[in-house]
Interface confidence: low
């Protein structure tokens, strides 16, 4: 007869490991007992369990509650056992020794491999600001057995670097993603992808990039100077900018205080019916935690009466 087993049995941490050992004997042969031992123990073989054809399953105290026979129906020639809830310390060599009648004893070895799926963690780098050079955007660390693979999935252009630390029963892999921050990266996802034979599917952790910036400021509303005449209602100036974090707006007048009746509503400066008093230099001040910008415009309110007077003078002078 001969023993049928596996060279390697692979399970994920926490799963049951079936350690196979089947005696394929000739007609009339019987299995008296099957002894299972940990074969790589430093102080010699350590018994796990013994299956006896008459007295049943005996389990070593060190494995009490963790070693069982497979569920029925059972073949009397099958000496396989289940090792419940595999832990990393279970990884190693196991020996199955079968005592048969009348053929004698047979033994076989297998290796139990316990996969430890990683629990990845993603750590964002320092605050990203437009104008910085190559900067750490995020680092991703995963520890498992065997060593996991850590990669990045993103549309953002950048560079990666990885390093690995080996521990006694596992390995930790850290991958860093560096980039040159620009405002176009704002809101873009940066995903750490961890692959491992103990995972049903890749684990993904997504970090949304936030890049601080402040665009140049400009003022809209003076495109047609002819509209800025005495008596006009609803005149307004709007300050245009964008930033991350979103900026705040402040309006001042360079050549004096804001005239009475002028309303400041965030990025908009609203005027009452225009008078020549509203002529002046107005400054929009845009700021966020990253930077500040100014834009100034000159408002020249036309007085039609003054203009017609000037025209008459010009005509009479000719």
């Amino acid at each position: 007869g001969e023993l049928e087993t596996s060279d390697v049995v692979t399970v994920v941490l926490g799963q049951d490991a079936k350690l196979p050992c089947f005696y394929r004997g000739d007609s009339g042969e019987q299995v008296g007992q099957v002894a299972w031992a940990r074969a790589d123990a430093g102080e010699g073989a350590q018994e796990l369990a013994l299956l006896h054809s008459k007295y049943g399953l005996h389990v070593s105290p060190a494995y009490e509650g963790r070693v069982e026979q497979p569920p029925p129906p059972r073949n009397p020639l099958d000496g396989s056992v289940l090792l419940r809830n595999a832990v990393q310390a279970d990884e190693g060599e196991y020996e199955c020794r079968v005592s048969t009648f009348p053929a004698g004893s047979f033994q076989a070895r297998l290796r139990l491999r316990v996969l430890v799926p990683p629990l990845p963690s993603l750590n964002p780098g320092p605050a990203l600001e437009e104008g910085q050079g190559l900067t750490l955007a995020a680092s991703c660390t995963a520890e498992g057995s065997p060593a996991p693979s850590v990669t990045w999935d993103t549309e953002v252009k950048g560079t990666t670097s990885s390093r690995s630390f080996k521990h006694s029963r596992s390995a930790a892999v850290t991958s860093e993603f560096h980039l040159v921050p620009s405002r176009s990266m704002n809101g873009q996802p940066l995903t750490c992808v961890v692959s491992h034979p103990g995972l049903l599917q890749d684990q993904r952790i997504t970090h949304i990039l936030h890049v601080s910036f402040l665009a140049e400021a400009s003022v809209r509303g003076l495109e047609d100077q002819n509209l800025w005449h005495v008596g006009r209602e609803g005149a307004m100036l709007k300050c245009l900018s964008e930033g991350q974090p979103p900026p705040s707006y402040n309006w001042t007048r360079l050549d004096g205080p804001l005239p009475s009746g002028v309303r400041v509503d965030g990025d908009t400066l609203g005027f009452p019916p225009l008078t020549t008093e509203h002529s002046g230099i107005y400054v929009c001040h845009v700021s966020n935690e990253f930077s500040s910008r100014d834009s100034q415009v000159t408002v020249d309110v036309l007085d039609p009466q003054e203009d017609s007077g000037k025209q008459v003078d010009l005509v009479s002078a000719s």
């Epitope: 994920v12 941490l13 926490g14 799963q15 049951d16 419940r84 809830n85 799926p117 629990l119 049903l200």
Partner: nanobody, 118 residues
Framework: EVQLVESGGGLVQAGGSLRLSCAAS????????MGWYRQAPGKQREYVAT???????NYADSVRGRFTISRDNAENTVYLQMDSLKPEDTAVYYC????????????WGRGTQVTVSS
């Protein structure tokens, strides 16, 4: 074949709590991932949370910090503790389990209704 039976659903006010249970007809040790999905009326089934046999967990962003998944391998049961419930959590909640033999096989329960009133 693995049978999954959910229980614990019901009607609860916004801000309240519920605990869903899912009992498996075989040892959950061999079910290396168990978890929960949900389906609101007229919407697609969406992922809620999963737990591995080793106890590692993962959650959808929409429930992270409010829901807690746990597992009792001795009782062959997985739980979903739902706190700070919102009306948008209203859905049929389905238990799922994956068994890996030569390839992954996914099993589903019949679902339990959770209704959150405002």
């Amino acid at each position: 074949e693995v049978q999954l039976v959910e229980s614990g659903g019901g009607l609860v006010q916004a801000g309240g709590s519920l605990r869903l249970s899912c009992a498996a007809s075989r040892s959950t040790f061999s079910l290396n991932i168990m978890g929960w999905y949900r389906q609101a009326p007229g919407k697609q089934r969406e992922y809620v949370a999963t737990i591995t046999s080793g106890g590692s967990t993962n959650y959808a962003d929409s429930v992270r910090g409010r829901f807690t998944i746990s597992r009792d391998n001795a009782e062959n049961t997985v739980y979903l503790q739902m706190d700070s419930l919102k009306p948008e959590d209203t859905a049929v909640y389905y238990c799922t389990a994956e068994l890996v033999r030569r390839g992954p096989t996914t099993y589903w329960g019949r679902g339990t209704q959770v209704t959150v009133s405002s």
